[in-house]
Interface confidence: medium
């Protein structure tokens, strides 16, 4: 008799998920010498232990604590780049500006980036058919809880000037419901963080508006100011030129506004 399997609204676990996590861990510990002590098999076991045999709508931050402990990592707290709805450019930036870090430049973020995973209650199987969708099914699913946990820890670790890259092409440049808006903003520590500097990335070439005056940016400024953190904002009118100037800052065209 075929066993009944819960059908969720979201895509199932990424194919070859265990192999992918293990391979990513090995590669990461290889190129980041300070993480070379990490035992990747133990990391996978802790990752698996967070969601296997558990109801995929009943996952807690506590479930991920063994993994968090194994993945403990010190990044320069004054070199943190947060992002919202503009991941690719943020990652391109830290690939060039290698002394700055997004969450996905840390071991745990690197392991899970772009992956989906979930298990089933009372069975050791990974569900490759479907996983809970955050909106349609439940918010306490393995993927959402993971990112909430690591994002909170990442924000808590930040100090001095923290940068955030925001997508100026979206209707809500700052979205209170994004991971940045709902988790990271509220976990920056005012006793450590002096300033949050937003970089608003423009989409259109002819877009010369000052998006730092957008109502959602003003809302972000208000939230941050109430938390006793200073706020500043910059328009990045030409993201392509911005990246080029990060690569070649001595270029004569890089003195003008980007």
């Amino acid at each position: 008799v075929p066993r009944w399997r819960q059908q969720w609204s979201g895509p199932g676990t990424t194919k070859r998920f265990p192999e992918t996590v293990l391979a990513r861990c090995v590669k990461y510990t290889e190129i980041h010498p300070e993480m070379r002590h990490v035992d990747c098999q133990s990391v996978w076991d802790a990752f698996k232990g967070a969601f296997i045999s558990k109801h995929p709508c009943n996952i807690t931050e506590e479930d991920y604590q063994p993994l968090m402990k194994l993945g403990t990592q010190t990044v320069p707290c004054n070199k943190i780049l947060l992002w919202s709805r503009i991941k690719d450019l943020a990652h391109q930036f830290t690939q060039v500006q290698r002394d700055m870090f997004t969450l996905e430049d840390t071991l745990l973020g690197y392991l899970a980036d772009d992956l989906t995973w979930c298990g089933e209650f009372n069975t050791s199987k990974i569900n490759y058919q479907s996983c809970p969708d955050w909106r349609k099914d439940c918010s306490n699913n393995p993927v959402s809880v993971f990112w909430k946990t690591v994002s909170r820890r990442f924000a808590e670790a930040a100090c001095d000037v923290v940068h955030v890259m925001l997508n100026g092409s979206r209707s809500k440049i700052f979205d209170k419901n994004s991971t940045f808006g709902s988790v990271e903003v509220h976990n920056l520590q005012p006793e450590k963080v002096q300033t949050l500097e937003a970089w608003v990335i423009h989409g259109g070439r002819e877009d010369s508006r000052d998006l730092c005056q957008d109502p959602t940016i003003k809302e972000l400024e208000s939230i941050i100011s109430k938390r006793n953190i200073q706020f500043s904002c910059k328009n990045i009118y030409r993201p392509d030129k911005f990246l080029q100037c990060v690569k070649n800052p001595e270029d004569s065209s890089c003195t003008s506004e980007i």
């Epitope: 090995v26 590669k27 290889e30 190129i31 010498p33 300070e34 320069p76 290698r98 002394d99």
Partner: antibody, heavy 120, light 110 residues
Framework: SLEESGGDLVKPGASLTLTCTAS?????????ICWVRQAPGKGLEWIAC???????TYYASWAKGRFTISKTSSTTVTLQMTSLTAADTATYFC???????????????WGPGTLVTVSS | AQVLTQTPSPVSAAVGGTVTINCQAS????????LAWFQQKPGQPPKLLIY???TLASGVPSRFKGSGSGTQFTLTISEVQSDDAATYYC??????????FGGGTEVVVK
Amino acid sequence: SLEESGGDLVKPGASLTLTCTASGFSFSSRYWICWVRQAPGKGLEWIACIVAGTTNTYYASWAKGRFTISKTSSTTVTLQMTSLTAADTATYFCAGDPRTGSNVGYFNLWGPGTLVTVSS
Amino acid sequence: AQVLTQTPSPVSAAVGGTVTINCQASQSVYNNNYLAWFQQKPGQPPKLLIYSASTLASGVPSRFKGSGSGTQFTLTISEVQSDDAATYYCQAYYSGGIYAFGGGTEVVVK
């Protein structure tokens, strides 16, 4: 010790494969084996590395595409070079970054080098 | 690309004197201290002098001293001897498995 072989006089456009051989030890899983070159009278230039245990490879941006580093046994690593030009004329060194203890991120073992000359 | 700029070159020193070589990185090196210094003499492979910015390699005289952090590094050779005549290179490691060498500084001993 490390020793390079395969250096030769070749014509522009030719391909060549260099070999790095370890003597007295085999590459541990964390060992990085790399190639560095030095044009006559010029400075050192990093080309590529391979990690013994995973065969993951890392290249200088200029070397991607024309140069391929491979591990062929527990004691040998090769560097395949294609579409050679006069600018590739150099002594090619094999170098090791052991990645043990505090030995990380630098080359503590070098071969004597092998000369590659590209000329018509 | 990561660029390491060495100055000055060449540098001249009298026996018994002191030589200072600077190495400036276009970006912070890995962990702010993944920088090594090498000595190279004609016809020979480079020889490791300093690693982790300031740690003396085995068998290297204490006359050689490395210092610095982030993007600015210095190699100081005190009580220079005629055998110190060579070309000196800095070498950095960057996240992502990237290595880079400085352009080299020739030390001439008078």
